[in-house]
Amino acid sequence: GDMLIEKTIKREVVLEEGTTAFKNWVKTGTTVYRQFWIFDVQNPDDVAKNSSKIKVKQRGPYTYRVRYLAKENITQDPEDHTVSFVQPNGAIFEPSLSVGTEDDNFTVLNLAVAAAPHIYQNSFVQVVLNSLIKKSKSSMFQTRSLKELLWGYKDPFLSLVPYPISTTVGVFYPYNDTVDGVYKVFNGKDNISKVAIIESYKGKRNLSYWPSYCDMINGTDAASFPPFVEKSRTLRFFSSDICRSIYAVFGSEIDLKGIPVYRFVLPANAFASPLQNPDNHCFCTEKVISNNCTSYGVLDIGKCKEGKPVYISLPHFLHASPDVSEPIEGLHPNEDEHRTYLDVEPITGFTLQFAKRLQVNILVKPARKIEALKNLKRPYIVPILWLNETGTIGDEKAEMFKTQVTGKIK
């Protein structure tokens, strides 16, 4: 009866050689796609000269297959019932699922020019940098191909900078041939309610990016959760993409290929200002851009990106405060298209379908010593791109799942 099913589930979700969970965990059977939409700036000269609103037009999707590589360096630790691993990164362009090629060009913010005065705040350094920006014929905006923008290009301005810095710039540079981790997660052998929960990341239990409890690594990596998920449970997970732990709450019941799943959604509350959600006070790390921590819907992850002025938000500034989106024209936030959700099968805790949506933005501020930025009259959080990473259990896998799990329970 139920006890037998529960016993079987508890056995099969453990992350060790021979279990159903382990096989799928090592290399996901789900095809995962990452779609990109690039924000093409329509009025670059007007912005640079007159500090006008930035007019953007999204272009996409440009689709890549990701997460197709198996976890590596898998090491079980029987002492503390954990398993450690790294997740290799790789992306393969999918032309048939894209509106164009990787060579398509876009007008976007010049990442190096925008970041330089933010990283080097000394006035004289900025005078030096300005001379190099001019020498390299760089300006506030640049035209780059999709491939360059995502995966990296040699920046002409940075190539002249005499400091020992990387001269290659790209939103996801470096990506291919890199790994995420080391992750160390509980295998659930001694306590099934801890299965897949992250014990440490890169050898640490905290991130060193945020003050107080915001710095904690909570929950799993969202690919699975401890079994027997209840609607009342808050699912906590860590996302290295956004350099923080976050949570999802129950939204609705869904039928996914005949499998009853719970759709958990990221609530607006997770992106709220400390004014609306006091728990978020430690995610507000600076007072100026955040208007004394009253702005919401954007997360400054600069500390996690070597001091670069990178801000993460939901696509089209969904759930963001009006002051954030006001300087940008052409954004159309939409809950259905732009929210993140996880469809979790409640008995096993496996995520059978998901859509992770996020937007990468760069802060650019007026800089009186940088000619390319001296006419700006206000700071802008400039959207560069947004992505939709999705995965759905395959038909075959779904049938197998129904037979082995949900069918038996019915």
Epitope: Y163, R368, K374
Partner: antibody, heavy 121, light 107 residues
């Protein structure tokens, strides 16, 4: 208070080199760049270049590249300037100077007393 | 390189008179102009920094104006202690360049 103490006057032969010093006190030496400025007798001022005291990165006026070499010794909070292949044109008072960063930048807010270099056979 | 042309080269004024010195730059430097006073045997002293900002402790009779390429330095009521050489410095771009100086004397 901020003080920049420069080394004494130098009388040098044409073709020779000279190295002068600028010892800083009253502030954290590596927090500020050090500039050097030339003033020929009865004439105007010329910016020679500057050095980042924290990592020894230098920025020179093209006119003085090959003539002046800027260095620092963090342990003694001292900046140095060496002038090579001296000619009578190099006879001048040389100043070290430091900026002040507040709400706006004050360039060369603090100056050393100057080192007089005389090039003569 | 931005050239800074300073005028006049010398100026003889009576105590209490208004003194005006002008600097013209070869390129647009916004308001990145600075003004220095140098007395004999001393290093220069910064009076006014970028943005026409009077430095702390500098008497209010000193002022400056200008933007772009044309800049003016003014002493409202000249005192005997104001006898000195005055220099402008553009700090917009490298290399920083000074004006050739103005020698202010008492008439």
């Amino acid at each position: 208070q901020v003080q920049l103490q420069q080394s004494g006057a130098e009388l040098v032969m044409p073709g020779a080199s000279v190295k002068m010093s600028c010892k800083a006190s009253g502030y954290t030496f590596t927090d500020y760049w050090m500039h050097w400025v030339k003033q020929r007798p009865g004439q105007g001022l010329e910016w020679i270049g500057a050095i980042d005291t924290s990592d020894s990165y230098t920025s020179y006026n093209q006119k003085f590249k090959g003539k002046a070499t800027l260095t620092v010794d963090e342990s003694s909070s001292t900046a140095y300037m060496q002038l090579s292949s001296l000619t009578s044109e190099d006879s001048a008072v040389y100043y070290c100077a430091r900026d002040y960063y507040g709400s706006s930048t004050a360039w060369f807010a603090y100056w050393g007393q100057g080192t007089l270099v005389t090039v003569s056979a | 390189e931005t050239t800074v042309t300073q005028s006049p080269a010398s100026l003889s004024m009576a105590i209490g008179e208004k003194v005006t010195i002008r600097c013209i730059t070869s390129t647009d430097i916004d308001d990145d102009m600075n003004w220095y006073q140098q007395k004999p045997g001393e290093p220069p002293k910064l009076l006014i920094s970028e943005g026409n900002t009077l430095r702390p402790g500098v008497p209010s009779r000193f002022s400056s104006s200008g933007y772009g390429t044309d800049f003016v330095f003014t002493i409202d009521n000249m005192l005997s202690e104001d006898v000195a050489d005055y220099y402008c410095l553009q700090s917009d771009n490298l290399p920083f360049t000074f004006g050739s100086g103005t020698k202010l004397e008492i008439k």
